[in-house]
């Protein structure tokens, strides 16, 4: 019979025949030949192969070098990589989680929307008009202004994006 | 190797503004942020800020908040650090440094003059 | 801000005599999360800053070890056992808790 050209998925071509790729966390040992299938060898400890394939080599495991902020969020398998993400307070640079940038905090006058985690950033809002923040944090919303009325009290000193309203007592002198 | 490699010196009239590049190369670029320090004649270290390149996402000192610009070009591997209304203040040396173990790598520095 | 605050600002050594650098911050550098973001950078004259300490102890890559880093969370110390003639310069702390990051005022290490 004619040599093959082209193999069906999960296998690869090699000295004109088909032979199977290793599965997920195993790596190739030899082709598979006229008369044998072909040997693979799971991946060792800390290694990892994620495809079908024709490696001779697994990947090692991403190290989660903890002198640059990084913890394991998940352990790697013979099958997948680990997953490295930030300590508290940080969060990963970028998707590769290589590094990691220490978290923002929203300046007086600016409140978080939505705060930070471990892949992404403090996400800061101006204050509106009626809302205030005299701190800078990474966690603290825009606060209301007092409500002066309801406490029977009236507005002495407006209020501002980064200051309260301060509220006195009403005048009892009216003419 | 990592390398940053900046722009040459520059001398600028007050009011105007200054761009200073540093170009990153031995490292993946966006897996770390960028940041801008200067240091005045005979002074010590001040932050200006850094960028994050993957995100394209700044965060600069309030003291130079609505002066100061910094981007990045991921295709060139390149910071890049604007700063405008110059005044005799800013004559300074401008370093960028990558935040890695701490500030691990850091650019020959780029002397920025200001005077009429 | 957080202020940082070096003593001495000028440091004359004999060379094979210890000497101390002194660092404090208006705040204590210690995160809930357990470290302490305190760094240490040495600027030899005409050269670029280089790190010699991160998280307050850790020793950077090829630096000697008669370098030592050691502190609480506001009061920080750099020892050097033995001075040699290439470690003199500007030796700054930096806090890295929070924006802005702040430096100390340096302190200019010579040789008598």
């Known amino acids: 019979p004619e040599p093959p050209t082209a193999c069906r998925e999960k296998q690869y071509l090699i000295n004109s025949q088909c032979c199977s790729l290793c599965q997920p966390g195993q790596k190739l040992v030899s082709d598979c030949t006229e008369f044998t299938e072909t040997e693979c060898l799971p991946c060792g400890e800390s290694e990892f192969l994620d495809t079908w394939n024709r490696e001779t080599h697994c990947h090692q495991h991403k190290y989660c070098d903890p002198n640059l902020g990084l913890r394991v969020q998940q352990k790697g398998t013979s099958e997948t990589d680990t997953i490295c993400t930030c300590e508290e307070g940080w969060h990963c640079t970028s998707e590769a989680c290589e590094s990691c940038v220490l978290h923002r905090s929203c300046s007086p006058g600016f409140g978080v929307k939505q705060i930070a985690t471990g892949v992404s950033d403090t996400i800061c809002e101006p204050c509106p008009v009626g809302f205030f923040s005299n701190v800078s944090s990474a966690f603290e919303k825009c606060h209301p202004w007092t409500s002066c009325e309801t406490k029977d009290l009236v507005v002495q000193q407006a209020g501002t994006n980064k200051t309260d309203v301060v509220c006195g007592p009403q005048d009892r002198l009216r003419a | 190797e990592v390398q940053l490699v900046q722009s040459g010196a520059e001398v600028k009239k007050p009011g105007s503004s200054v761009k200073v590049s540093c170009k990153a190369s031995?490292?993946?670029?966006?897996?770390?942020?960028m940041h801008w320090v200067r240091q005045a004649p005979g002074q010590g270290l001040e932050w200006m800020g850094y960028i994050n390149p993957s995100s394209d996402y700044p965060n600069y000192n309030q003291k130079f908040k609505d002066r100061v610009t910094i981007t990045a070009d991921k295709s060139t591997s390149t910071a890049y650090m604007e700063l405008s209304s110059l005044r005799s203040e800013d004559t300074a040396v401008y370093y960028c440094a990558r935040w890695g173990y701490s500030f691990d790598y850091w650019g020959q520095g780029t002397t920025v003059t200001v005077s009429s | 801000d957080i202020v940082m605050t070096q003593s001495p600002l000028s440091l004359p050594v004999t060379p094979g005599e210890p000497a101390s650098i002194s660092c404090r911050s208006s705040k204590s550098l210690l995160h809930s999360n357990g470290n302490t973001y305190l760094y240490w950078f040495l600027q030899k004259p005409g050269q670029s800053p280089q790190y010699l300490i991160y998280r307050m102890s850790t020793l950077a890559s090829g630096v000697p070890d008669r370098f030592s880093g050691s502190g609480s969370g506001t009061d920080f110390t750099l020892k050097i056992s033995r001075v040699e003639a290439e470690d003199v310069g500007v030796y700054y702390c930096m806090q890295h808790l929070e924006y802005p990051l702040t430096f100390g005022q340096g302190t200019k290490l010579e040789i008598k």
């Open positions: 031995g490292y993946t670029f966006t897996s770390y942020t």
